[in-house]
């Protein structure tokens, strides 16, 4: 995977929250849930209230990248999804407010959001070859592809 210095000269400026309170389901129709405080995992749920609700904030790149760059926050909290290394769980990082500017090593908070039909992919800005992924009997992590599941459906307006 790419080192953190890869995009260290690029500055990302916060624009606005573009989605509120959505659920992420993987290709096996498992929802992302919050497990054991600082990790996320995927589970088939009878009760969707157990699924994490996310907010998505958009950032603009100083190099005018065509990609949509986003931050993912657990709704009604100050917890942000943070990338580590390949096959490592993503962490929940607590911050007092959404960062106005992100650069250098802090790009582990950012993801490139791509959509292909109903499929959504979140690539780590810090590790551009790695995606947010679910893995059987494991935490939500960063992975390059199969056997991890890297495509998600966004479920909005869940009552």
């Amino acid at each position: 995977s790419a080192p953190f210095s890869f995009l260290s000269n690029v500055k990302y400026n916060f624009m606005r929250i573009i989605k509120y309170e959505f659920i992420l389901n993987d290709a096996l129709n498992q929802s992302i849930i919050r497990a054991n405080d600082q990790y996320l995992t995927a589970a088939a749920l009878h009760n969707l209230d157990e699924a994490v609700k996310f907010d998505m904030g958009a950032y603009k790149s100083s190099k005018d990248d065509a990609k949509i760059t986003v931050i993912l926050r657990i709704s009604k909290t100050q917890l942000y999804v943070t990338a580590q290394d390949e096959d490592q769980p993503v962490l929940l990082k607590e911050m007092p407010e959404i960062p106005k500017t992100i650069t250098g090593s802090e790009t582990n908070l950012l993801f490139f959001w791509e959509t292909h039909g109903t499929k959504n992919y979140f690539t780590s800005v810090a590790h551009p070859n790695l995606f947010i992924a679910t893995k059987q009997d494991y935490w939500v992590c960063l992975a390059g592809g199969p056997p991890s599941i890297t495509d998600f459906q966004i479920l909005e307006n869940q009552a």
């Epitope: 849930i33 995992t41 589970a43 609700k53 909290t77």
Partner: antibody, heavy 122, light 107 residues
Framework: EVQLVQSGAEVKKPGVSVKVSCKAS????????MHWVRQAPGQGLEWMGW????????TYADDFQGRVTFTLDTSTSTAYMELSSLRSEDTAVYFC???????????????WGQGTTVTVSS | DIQMTQSPSSLSASVGDRVTITCRAS??????LNWYQQKPGKTPKLLIY???RLYPGVPSRFSGSGSGTDYTFTISSLQPEDIATYFC?????????FGQGTKLEIK
């Protein structure tokens, strides 16, 4: 079916320790935090703390800090609570409870053990 | 730490009555409030989570409401099997404090 089965009642003398077990089944043990709550006779519920079943890290309520220890045996999906320097005021029913986040933000305890009665008497 | 104050500590009502219990948090808990029922000699059971969401299998006569620091638990029509002690609990931040409980009796 999710189940939390606790060890049997204990009678202890003041000053010694007690260790209560809580065996989980019906779910992946390391996915959900385990809490310990006690209830003195005729009293309310008192949160003692919790253990992260994946990392083994514990957080203890201030009133129990230094006197309580939570441990795990992940091979048997069992959580343990040990309370030391027992005194008569520790006479209570001790519950383990599985924690869950709703919406990823709001924490509740949706499965409870049957409780273990600990009596401290000289 | 967040303190939870529950009232009343006990109440007596007749079958069919509407019963209301209140819980006040020492600071805003953003609707992260749960209610539990504990019958005599039994383990606590989660009834309501996130202020107003009914836990699966819980009868619809139980409900919850509120926001900020003030929350209410209601039994719309009291049944004999509802005799129990009810506890609120904040689920926003550690330590996860409980209210002191409300003991409900039948007149």
């Amino acid at each position: 079916e999710v189940q939390l089965v606790q060890s049997g009642a204990e009678v202890k003398k003041p000053g010694v320790s007690v260790k209560v077990s809580c065996k989980a089944s019906g779910y992946t043990f390391t996915t959900y935090g385990m809490h310990w709550v006690r209830q003195a006779p005729g009293q309310g519920l008192e949160w003692m703390g919790w253990i992260n079943t994946y990392t083994g890290e514990s957080t203890y309520a201030d009133d129990f800090q230094g006197r309580v220890t939570f441990t795990l045996d992940t091979s048997t999906s069992t959580a343990y609570m040990e309370l030391s320097s027992l005194r008569s005021e520790d006479t209570a029913v001790y519950f383990c409870a599985r924690g869950i986040y709703y919406y990823g933000s709001s924490y509740a305890m949706n499965y409870w053990g049957q409780g273990t009665t600990v009596t401290v008497s000289s | 730490d967040i303190q939870m104050t529950q009232s009343p500590s006990s109440l007596s009502a007749s079958v069919g009555d509407r019963v209301t219990i209140t819980c006040r948090a020492s600071q805003d808990i953003s609707n992260m409030l749960n209610w539990y029922q504990q019958k005599p000699g039994k383990t606590p059971k989660l009834l309501i989570y996130y202020t107003s969401r009914l836990y699966p299998g819980v009868p619809s006569r139980f409900s919850g409401s509120g926001s900020g620091t003030d929350y209410t638990f209601t039994i719309s029509s009291l049944q004999p099997e509802d005799i129990a002690t009810y506890f609120c609990q904040q689920g926003k931040t550690l330590p996860y404090a409980f209210g002191q409980g409300t003991k409900l009796e039948i007149k």
